[in-house]
C-alpha cells in the first residue's frame, strides 16, 4: 500500500555538515576551559541570551550568537583546593557551575553556583536599556548559594525567582541527600520542604517550576515544581520511578507551631505518561526531563508539555504527554493518598478532611484566613502527613501526542511555538536528543482536537558531536531556537521553507506550518498575507488539491530527471533514486524497450531494493529498457527519474576494452554519442572495474586510475583534472553516506 | 516549660540489652525531631541516633548501627533507645535531646536537652 | 577523635575576652553548614548557647558571641565571669554517617 508512507520518520533529516552549508545553523563551540553551556535565560526585550557554564556566564545576541560578552566566575584556589582535598574531581566538580540565572530587576540578574561545592549566588548588573551595554559582575555583593543552587555540578535545580524571592528545588548539603524546596531572598526566613520524610521528597530530580495563578486574585497565586523521583514503597513494587507535579503557595509563610518555617500548602501527585498494552499492562514513561508552558490567551491554564523517557535499560523510548491545569487542579482537589503504616498499601483518605483544605492559598476567596500562620493545629497536622494526592494526573486524550521508541535516541528538552497556518492553529513541538539532535514535531488534529497526528517534519544535528542537549529557549521574536550543551551553544532558525523543494506538492507534502507554497516557492507562511495566493494544508499534506491548478505532466510542475545507463551482461548495476523526503516511499516501474506499458518491479534474487535505488545483478539483455522511479507520498506521486539501461553483451565488451585509449572504435563511437569527452575516460575505467578478474577491490582500482591520471597530467600540462576527483567522491561515499537530496550528478553510477 | 526525663540507665553486662525512654511534656511532641546523644566519662558529646517526627526517617552513628534501635510513641509523648549487644564502650551518660531547627537554614541543633541517664557495661 | 577541633582548654581572668575555636572541613563547616556552640556546667545536661553560627537563644547574656568563616567557627566571651566557667562544644551538620557532629569540648577556666 503506497498510500500510507512512513509517518514516524523525519520527513528531512539534515547532518551537521548539511545544516552548515545551507547556513541553518550558528554554533558557538564553546571555550577551552569552560564547558556545560546548561543554564539559559533568554531576554526578548534585550535581544540577549544569557547562559550559565562552568566558571563563565555569557550574553549571547539572540540575532547571531557568535555576537557575545562574557563574564569570567571561578573560584579562589583556596577553594578549588579544599574540593579536591574532599576528593572530587577537580576538573568536572572544582569549579563554579552556573545552576541559577534569573531576572532579578529590571537591571539585574542573579546568578548562583556550585563555587566548587560551597555554593555562591551574585547579582549581574545588566543596565537600564539594552542600547546601556553593561554585563558584569557585582563583585561587592556574594551570598550563601546554599538552599539555591546544589553542591554537586552534577544534580539538577529547578527555580525561579518572583517578587524578589527565590523558589528552588536543589539539594541543601554537601552529600547531595537533603533535598528540599526552598524559598530565599527577600525579607522573610527561608521557608522549605520537611525534612527527613520521604514522603514529601524522595529523592527528587527537578526539573521546572512555574508561577500560575489560580484566579484574579494574587493571593492565590501558586508555584508548580516540576520533577521526578523515586516512587514511596507500597506504591509501587520494586524500584519505580515516578513523574510529579508539586504546588506550593506563593504566600505560604509556614505553620505556627508545627512546620514552623516549612511549606503547609505543598502538595504533589503523579504525572502519568503511559501507552495502553496488552493484557492491561501499559508501556509507562516516567522519568520526566522536561517541561514546557504552553501560555496562550488564559495564562491561568497553560497547557503543559511534558517529555518522558523509559526507566528500563532494556527498552529504551521517549514521549511527550500534554496536561491540561484544569485536570491537574481537579486531582488536587481530590483524595489525598494515605496509609496506615509502612507495610499497608496507599489507599484514598476516607477520613474527614480539615477546614479550609489543606493546599489551598489563604486568601479572600477560599476562606477567611489572613496567613498559613492562622491555620488550624487540624490542617497543618493533615496537610504535614498528607503530602500526596491519591489521584494521578492524566495527559489530554489518555495517550502521548509523540512516541519514540526505535530509535538510538532519547528527548531531553522540548519548547513549543504555537503557530497560525492557513487552516487553524498549530503547536510545533521542537524536541532536543541525547545525541545532540533536534527534532520539529507537529502535532495536527484529525477527527477532534483531542485526537492528534505526530507529523515528524524534520531531525536536524545541531552539534557536531553527539552531545546532550540540555537547554532549549525558542524566541518567536527573531523566530530562532538556542540550544545547549556541555559542548556548546546552537541557533537555529524555526523554519527553513525552501528546503523542502521547489514545488508545490514538495511544500504542501511537508506540512510545516511555517511553510506555504507562494506561487513560485515554499516560503514562510503570514496569516496576513493575500489568501489566494497560498498553497498550504496542514491538517492533510493533500497536494492533489491544493497544488492541482499548478499540475503539469507530472503533478508538481517538473518533468523528471533522466538518465542514461550501460551495464555489462552479466555484472551488476545500481540505480539510484533516493528521494529528499524520508517518509516517501519509492517504487520502481519497468518499461521494455518499444513498449508502452509499464509493470512495477517486483523483488527477487535478480532485483534488490534498497533505500538507495535499485540494485540488478547479472544483467541479461532482457532488463534493457525504461526504469522510472516514482515517490509516493500522502497519496501523492512523483516521477523523480527515468532510467534507460542499455545493457552491452560481453563480446561487444571485449572489442572496447582492447581498443586503444585513443582508438576510433565505431561501436565505441555508437555508444558514446551521449556522452562529453571528459565522461568517456571514466566510462572506460567503470567497465574495467565491474568486469575485471584481476582487480579485486575498487580501492586497487582507483589506485590505478589516480596513476595513470597523474602520468597522464605529467605528460599533459593542459589536462584539466576532472576524473580522478570523481573516483575520489565515489571512495568518500563509499566510507558511509547519508545523502539526503537528489544525487543523479555522480560519477560513475549514472551518465 | 519544656522538660525531657530520661529513665532506664542502669548497670549491665556485655552482651546485655537495656531500654532508655525520654518523656517529653511542654510541647507538641509530634511536631519535632528526637536524639539521643552520649557523653562517655570525662570525654567530649557524641550523636548516637535521631527520629523524625512520623519515623519515617531514622538515622544511627556507625559506632551503634545494627544494635541499638530508636523509636517513638507520639501518643504517650515518649521517645526510646533500645541497647542491645552492649560494649565497654557504649558505658556514659544518655541525653534525649530535641532538634529546634532554629536557623535559617534548618541545620539541626539541640534547642532542649534531658538531665541525662548513666549506662554502664561492666562485667 | 572528634570531626571539629577544639582547644582542649582555654583560660582568662575574670572581665577578660576570651575566644574557642572550632576547626572543621570542606564536608562541614566548609560546606556553608551552620555551627552551633553549646555550654556544659559542670554535673549538668548541655544548654544551647549559640545557634546559626551567631544567634543567642532568649536568656543567653550578649557576652556570648559566635561567628564563622570558611572551615572554622569562634565563640567570643567577653567580660568573662566565674559562672562562665564550663565545657564549651561545638556541633555542625555533616549529612548522613554521621548525621551531626561535635567538637572535642574545651574547658573553659576563669582565673
Known amino acids: 500500500n503506497y498510500q500510507n508512507g512512513k509517518n514516524n520518520v523525519p520527513r528531512l533529516k539534515l547532518s551537521y555538515k548539511e545544516m552548515l552549508e545551507s547556513n541553518n545553523v550558528i554554533t558557538f563551540n564553546g571555550l577551552a576551559n569552560s564547558s556545560s553551556y546548561h543554564t539559559f535565560l533568554l531576554d526578548e526585550e534585550r535581544s540577549r541570551l544569557y547562559v550559565g557554564a562552568k566558571d563563565h556566564i555569557f550574553s549571547f545576541d539572540l540575532v547571531n550568537i557568535k555576537d557575545f560578552q562574557k563574564i569570567v566566575w571561578p573560584v579562589s584556589y583556596t577553594r578549588r583546593d579544599e574540593c579536591k582535598w574532599a576528593g572530587k574531581d577537580i576538573l568536572k566538580e572544582c569549579a563554579n557551575f552556573i545552576k541559577v540565572l534569573k531576572a532579578y530587576n529590571q537591571t539585574h540578574l542573579y546568578a548562583c553556583g556550585t563555587g566548587a561545592f560551597h555554593p555562591i549566588c551574585t547579582y549581574i548588573e545588566i543596565g537600564h536599556h539594552p542600547e546601556d551595554n553593561i554585563f558584569k559582575l557585582e563583585n561587592s555583593h556574594f551570598e550563601n548559594g546554599r538552599g539555591k543552587s546544589p553542591y554537586d555540578p552534577k544534580l539538577l535545580t529547578a527555580s525561579l525567582l518572583i517578587d524578589g524571592e527565590l523558589y528552588s528545588g536543589t539539594a541543601a548539603d554537601f552529600m547531595g541527600r537533603d533535598f528540599a524546596i526552598f524559598r530565599t531572598l527577600g525579607h522573610h526566613h527561608p521557608i522549605r520542604t520537611e525534612q527527613h520524610d520521604s514522603r514529601w521528597l524522595n529523592d527528587p530530580k527537578f526539573i521546572s517550576a512555574h508561577l500560575i495563578s489560580e484566579s484574579d486574585n494574587p493571593e492565590d497565586d501558586k508555584v508548580y515544581f516540576f520533577f521526578r523521583e523515586n516512587a514511596i514503597d507500597g506504591e509501587h513494587s520494586g524500584k519505580a520511578t515516578h513523574a510529579r507535579i508539586g504546588q506550593i503557595c506563593k504566600n505560604d509563610f509556614g505553620g505556627h507551631r508545627s512546620l514552623v518555617n516549612k511549606w503547609t500548602t505543598f502538595l504533589k501527585a503523579r504525572l502519568i505518561c503511559s501507552v495502553p498494552g496488552p493484557n492491561g499492562i501499559d508501556t509507562h514513561f516516567d522519568e520526566l526531563q522536561d517541561v514546557f508552558l504552553m501560555n496562550f490567551k488564559d495564562p491561568k491554564n497553560p497547557v503543559v508539555y511534558g517529555v518522558f523517557t523509559t526507566s528500563s535499560n532494556i527498552f529504551k523510548g521517549s514521549a511527550v504527554c500534554m496536561y491540561s491545569m484544569s485536570d491537574v487542579r481537579r486531582v488536587f482537589l481530590g483524595p489525598y493518598a494515605h496509609r496506615d503504616g509502612p507495610n499497608y498499601q496507599w489507599v484514598p483518605y476516607q477520613g474527614r478532611v480539615p477546614y479550609p483544605r489543606p493546599g489551598t492559598c489563604p486568601s479572600k476567596t477560599f476562606g477567611g484566613f489572613d496567613s498559613t500562620k492562622d491555620l488550624p493545629d487540624d490542617v497543618i497536622t493533615f496537610a504535614r502527613s498528607h503530602p500526596a494526592m491519591y489521584n494521578p494526573v492524566f495527559p489530554m486524550n489518555n495517550r502521548p501526542i509523540v512516541i519514540k521508541t526505535d530509535v538510538n535516541y532519547q528527548f531531553t528538552q522540548i519548547v513549543v511555538d504555537r503557530v497560525d497556518a492557513e487552516d487553524g492553529q498549530y503547536d510545533v513541538m521542537f524536541i532536543g536528543t541525547d545525541v545532540g539532535t533536534v527534532l520539529k514535531v507537529v502535532s495536527i488534529p484529525k477527527e477532534t482536537w483531542y485526537d492528534l497526528e505526530e507529523v515528524l517534519l524534520e531531525e536536524m544535528t545541531v552539534f557536531r558531536e553527539p552531545t546532550a542537549i540540555s537547554a532549549m529557549e525558542l524566541s518567536t521574536k527573531q523566530q530562532q531556537l538556542y540550544i545547549g550543551s556541555t559542548a556548546g551553544v546552537a541557533q537555529l532558525p524555526l523554519h527553513r521553507c525552501d528546503i523542502y523543494g521547489k514545488a508545490c506538492a514538495e511544500c504542501c507534502l511537508a506540512r510545516d506550518p511555517y511553510c506555504a507554497w507562494d506561487g513560485s516557492a515554499c516560503s514562510r507562511y503570514f496569516p496576513t498575507a493575500k489568501r489566494r495566493t497560498r498553497r498550504q494544508d496542514i491538517r492533510n499534506g493533500d497536494p492533489l488539491t491544493h497544488c492541482s491548478d499548478l499540475h503539469h505532466d507530472n503533478h508538481h510542475g517538473h518533468s523528471p530527471e533522466e538518465r542514461i545507463i550501460y551495464g555489462v551482461e552479466n555484472s551488476s548495476t545500481f540505480l539510484e533514486c533516493s528521494p529528499k523526503s524520508q517518509r516517501a516511499l519509492v517504487y520502481w516501474q519497468f518499461q521494455r524497450r518499444n513498449e508502452e506499458r509499464k509493470e512495477e518491479i517486483r523483488v527477487d534474487d535478480h532485483i534488490i531494493r534498497t533505500d538507495q535505488g535499485l540494485l540488478l545483478r547479472s544483467l541479461q539483455q532482457k532488463d534493457s529498457g525504461n526504469y522510472l522511479c516514482h515517490a509516493v507520498e500522502h497519496g501523492f506521486i512523483q516521477t523523480l527519474l527515468k532510467v534507460t539501461l542499455e545493457v552491452i553483451d560481453t563480446e561487444h565488451l571485449e572489442e572496447l576494452l582492447h581498443k586503444d585509449d585513443d582508438g576510433d572504435g565505431s561501436k565505441t563511437k555508437e555508444m558514446s554519442n551521449s556522452m562529453t569527452p571528459s565522461q568517456k575516460v571514466w566510462y572506460r575505467d567503470f567497465m574495467q572495474l565491474i568486469n575485471h578478474p584481476n582487480l579485486n577491490t575498487m580501492d586497487e582500482f582507483c589506485e590505478q586510475v589516480w596513476k595513470r591520471d597523474r602520468k597522464q597530467r605529467r605528460q599533459r600540462p593542459g589536462h584539466t583534472p576532472g576524473n580522478s576527483n570523481k573516483w575520489k567522491h565515489l571512495q568518500e561515499n563509499k566510507k558511509g553516506r547519508n545523502r539526503r537530496t537528489h544525487e543523479f550528478e555522480r560519477a560513475p553510477r549514472s551518465v | 516549660e519544656v522538660q525531657l526525663l530520661e529513665s532506664g540507665g542502669g548497670l549491665v553486662q556485655p552482651g546485655g540489652s537495656l531500654r532508655l525512654s525520654c518523656a517529653a511534656s511542654g510541647f507538641t511532641f509530634d511536631s519535632y525531631e528526637m536524639n539521643w546523644v552520649r557523653q562517655a566519662p570525662g570525654k567530649g558529646l557524641e550523636w548516637v541516633s535521631g527520629?523524625?517526627?512520623?519515623?519515617?526517617?531514622?538515622d544511627y552513628a556507625d559506632s551503634v548501627k545494627g544494635r541499638f534501635t530508636i523509636s517513638r510513641d507520639n501518643s504517650k509523648n515518649t521517645l526510646y533507645l533500645q541497647m542491645n549487644s552492649l560494649r565497654a564502650e557504649d558505658t556514659a551518660v544518655y541525653y534525649c535531646a530535641r532538634s529546634g531547627y532554629s536557623s535559617s537554614w534548618f541545620d539541626p541543633d539541640f534547642d532542649y536537652w534531658g538531665q541525662g541517664t548513666l549506662v554502664t557495661v561492666s562485667s | 577523635q572528634s570531626v571539629l577541633t577544639q582547644p582542649p582548654s582555654v583560660s582568662g581572668a575574670p572581665g577578660q575576652r576570651v575566644t574557642i575555636s572550632c576547626t572543621g572541613s570542606s564536608s562541614n563547616i566548609g560546606a556553608g553548614y551552620d555551627v552551633h556552640w553549646y555550654q556544659q556546667l559542670p554535673g549538668t545536661a548541655p544548654k544551647l548557647l549559640i545557634y546559626g553560627n551567631s544567634n543567642r537563644p532568649s536568656g543567653v547574656p550578649d557576652r556570648f558571641s559566635g561567628s564563622k568563616s570558611g572551615t572554622s567557627a569562634s565563640l567570643a566571651i567577653t567580660g568573662l565571669q566565674a559562672e562562665d566557667e564550663a565545657d564549651y562544644y561545638c556541633q555542625s551538620y555533616a549529612g548522613p554517617n554521621p548525621y551531626v557532629v561535635f567538637g572535642g569540648g574545651t574547658k573553659l577556666t576563669v582565673l
Open positions: 527520629i523524625s517526627w512520623n519515623s519515617g526517617w531514622i
